[in-house]
């Protein structure tokens, strides 16, 4: 999906209002410095591409993030403010339903959510502090 035509201001508002709080709750008890940055993004559409990948694509080390509250809200936000996004996700959702539910918060999931926080922080800053 090409995130170029999303309403970035509305997505930013949703992130600050709800998604950020859910991410921080998930990370409670860990410091942001516990994990090094292993993923970055270079503009707002790119950030959303990487956020979608980390949130919804299960990895061998962390298979369960898509069921978390922050993931559900992320999905709803993208569906609301990115034209045509929900249509592209129908097949992905059906595939996700077939997977077994795993509710263990592993250290690797914490690391992945730490990376997500970093991506969202990059997304919400419209510019670097300086040129």
């Amino acid at each position: 999906y090409d995130f170029t035509n999303c309403d970035f201001q509305k997505i930013e508002a949703d992130y600050l209002r709800t998604i950020s709080k859910d991410l921080i709750t998930y990370m409670s008890g860990t410091k942001s410095t516990d994990f090094n940055n292993t993923v970055s993004c270079s503009n707002r559409p790119h950030c959303l591409t990487e956020i979608q990948s980390l949130t919804f694509n299960p990895t061998p080390r962390c298979a369960s993030l898509a069921k978390e509250m922050f993931a559900r809200k992320t999905k709803a936000t993208l569906a609301l403010w990115c034209p045509g996004y929900s249509e592209t996700q129908i097949n992905a959702t059906q595939a996700m339903k077939k997977r077994r539910k795993r509710k263990v918060t592993t250290n690797k999931c914490l690391e992945q959510v730490s990376q997500l926080l970093g991506l969202w922080r990059r997304f919400i800053r419209t510019l670097l502090k300086k040129q």
């Epitope: 940055n37 292993t38 993923v39 970055s40 993004c41 270079s42 503009n43 790119h46 990487e50 990059r122 800053r125 510019l127 670097l128 502090k129 300086k130 040129q131």
Partner: antibody
Framework: QMQLVESGGGVVQPGRSLRLSCAAS????????MHWVRQAPGKGLEWVAV????????HYADSVKGRFTITRDNSKNTLNLQMNSLRAEDTAVYYC???????????????WGQGTMVTVSS | SYVLTQPPSVSVAPGQTARITCGGN??????VHWYQQKPGQAPVLVVY???DRPSWIPERFSGSNSGNTATLTISRGEAGDEADYYC???????????FGGGTKLTVL
């Protein structure tokens, strides 16, 4: 566990070519800008080139423009530097490094390789 | 093209504060990064975006930037701080990375 490992250095005659590679691991390579920086013996750091995270754009120092080409293969997590028409003044340790970028601005180089030595001598 | 000027050398007594400067035209409008390099080793980022510090760097390292001068400050200097220090900026007008010439810090 985040790592950059350079290879391909060696001794080469003036006017000849050499190709350096940098293997990345432990991070999502495709999301970072990647640089080559060199250091001549006993001298300071000199930036050589950078390639955008996507591979779409490149920028070069004037001293290597037209002779060196930086490329990346995001599917293999590798960065390359093709060096043609080498000169004695290209003798240096060559480092690859990563930096986040925002739009067309490159940020600090937070991970560096250990470097590979290139000697241009007849 | 944009030029960054550093003093070739700076000395500090153990436990004292060292300040390494980096001069450039209106450098305060740019984000300055600082690297430490020990002999035979690759550079290590110690301060980025003027004054931010990577999580692995001790709080003794700090930075500031305004006007035509950026400064790296190393408080409570230790023998292990002996190294070459380089400032660096991204010059948007020419799309080039620029390094300063480097400063050799000696802990007496």
């Amino acid at each position: 566990q985040m790592q950059l490992v350079e290879s391909g250095g060696g001794v080469v005659q003036p006017g000849r070519s050499l190709r350096l590679s940098c293997a990345a691991s432990g991070f999502t390579f495709r999301t970072y800008g990647m640089h080559w920086v060199r250091q001549a013996p006993g001298k300071g750091l000199e930036w050589v080139a950078v390639v955008w995270y996507s591979g779409s754009y490149t920028h070069y120092a004037d001293s290597v423009k037209g002779r060196f080409t930086i490329t990346r293969d995001n599917s293999k997590n590798t960065l390359n530097l093709q060096m043609n028409s080498l000169r004695a003044e290209d003798t240096a340790v060559y480092y690859c490094s990563r930096s986040p970028q925002w739009e067309d601005i490159f940020e600090a180089m937070d991970i560096w390789g250990q470097g590979t030595m290139v000697t241009v001598s007849s | 093209s944009y030029v960054l000027t550093q003093p070739p050398s700076v000395s500090v007594a153990p436990g004292q504060t060292a300040r390494i400067t980096c001069g450039g035209n209106n450098i305060g409008s740019k984000s300055v990064h600082w690297y430490q390099q020990k002999p035979g080793q690759a550079p290590v980022l110690v301060v980025y975006d003027d004054s931010d510090r990577p999580s692995w760097i001790p709080e003794r390292f700090s930075g500031s930037n305004s006007g035509n001068t950026a400064t790296l400050t190393i408080s409570r200097g230790e023998a292990g701080d002996e190294a070459d220090y380089y400032c660096q900026v991204w010059d948007s007008s020419s799309s080039l990375v620029v390094f300063g010439g480097g400063t050799k810090l000696t802990v007496l």
